[in-house]
């Protein structure tokens, strides 16, 4: 789980070691702060749990792509 060391900076110290179905993911945010030990992605699930994931993993990239497509507004 993400840790807020000094709000508002949230850092991840461990990553999930399992894929999470993309259908369970609601949104994500990237963690790039120099105050954090590693770059990370924090996914928020449909039941509002927050999960730290490794942005280098393919499933994480696929999930972010999927969520990006989902949130794009349709062109008229």
């Amino acid at each position: 789980q993400p840790d807020a060391i000094n709000a508002p900076v949230t850092c991840c110290y461990n990553f999930t070691n399992r894929k999470i179905s993309v259908q369970r993911l609601a949104s994500y945010r990237r963690i790039t702060s120099s105050k954090c030990p590693k770059e990370a992605v924090i996914f928020k699930t449909i039941v509002a749990k927050e999960i730290c994931a490794d942005p280098k993993q393919k499933w994480v990239q696929d999930s972010m792509d999927h969520l990006d497509k989902q949130t794009q507004t349709p062109k008229t």
Epitope: R18, Q23, A26, T45, I46, K49, I51
Partner: antibody, heavy 119, light 113 residues
């Protein structure tokens, strides 16, 4: 395509334990979240527990807590379900089942393992 | 925990007639941002594992005949077999996958009248 192959039927005495295996092929076990569902004769489907990646741990149905242990051997891509202190009402077919990254629901099932508990 | 309640427990329908099974959840299975209901329907025949028929409450799995349809949203769902065939005799289950623990309905047995 995921394939799940379970161990064979077992006959156990009340009070004993049983360990059912589920061998994964087509994917590695660490890419999946394995769950176990049982079905007593003439009864419905009952979720027993499984790996919840949102919590990062295996979770169990309250009914089975303390009696069931679900483990994995990632070197052989095999999942195990051990049920202890068996009673006659544990006689059932036990299924392993898993979801797919793109689906989120149980779309792959093992063939089932019949466990008979009888004195 | 989310409780899933199916009705009826069993029904007998003539060949070629419509069969309707209802499933009610104790809380909403709709995630509105995705506009998806986290509910599936399974068919189970004796000695076989459950077979997935419908996902997302209304999407037929590949290879499932179009006489099977799913509808509903939120807490109330329906599986309809528009024209019952002999091979449809089975037990049907709904299951939610919105939040753990995953829960099933008690099942509905469909027979031929």
């Amino acid at each position: 395509q995921v394939q799940l192959v379970q161990s064979g039927a077992e006959v156990k005495k009340p009070g004993a334990s049983v360990k059912v295996s589920c061998k994964v092929s087509g994917y590695t076990l660490t890419e999946l979240s394995m769950h176990w569902v049982r079905q007593a004769p003439g009864k419905g489907l009952e979720w027993m527990g499984g790996f919840d990646p949102e919590d990062g741990e295996t979770i169990y149905a309250q009914k089975f807590q303390g009696r069931v242990t679900m483990t994995e051997d990632t070197s052989t891509d095999t999942a195990y379900m051990e049920l202890s202190s068996l009673r006659t009402e544990d006689t059932a077919v036990y299924y392993c089942t898993t979801d797919d990254f793109w689906s989120g629901y149980f779309d792959y099932w093992g063939q089932g393992t019949l466990v008979t508990v009888s004195s | 925990d989310i409780v899933m309640t199916q009705s009826p427990d069993s029904l007998a329908v003539s060949l070629g007639e419509r069969a309707t099974i209802n499933c009610k959840s104790s809380q909403s299975l709709l995630y509105s941002s995705k506009n998806k209901n986290y509910l599936v329907w399974y068919q189970q025949k004796p000695g076989q594992p459950p077979k997935l028929l419908i996902n997302w409450a209304s999407t037929r799995e590949s290879g499932v005949p179009d006489r099977f349809s799913g509808s509903g949203s939120g807490t109330d769902f329906t599986l309809t077999i528009s024209s019952l065939q002999a091979e449809d005799v089975a037990v049907y289950y709904c299951q939610q996958y919105y939040s753990s623990p995953w829960t099933f309905g008690q099942g509905t047995k469909v027979e031929i009248k």
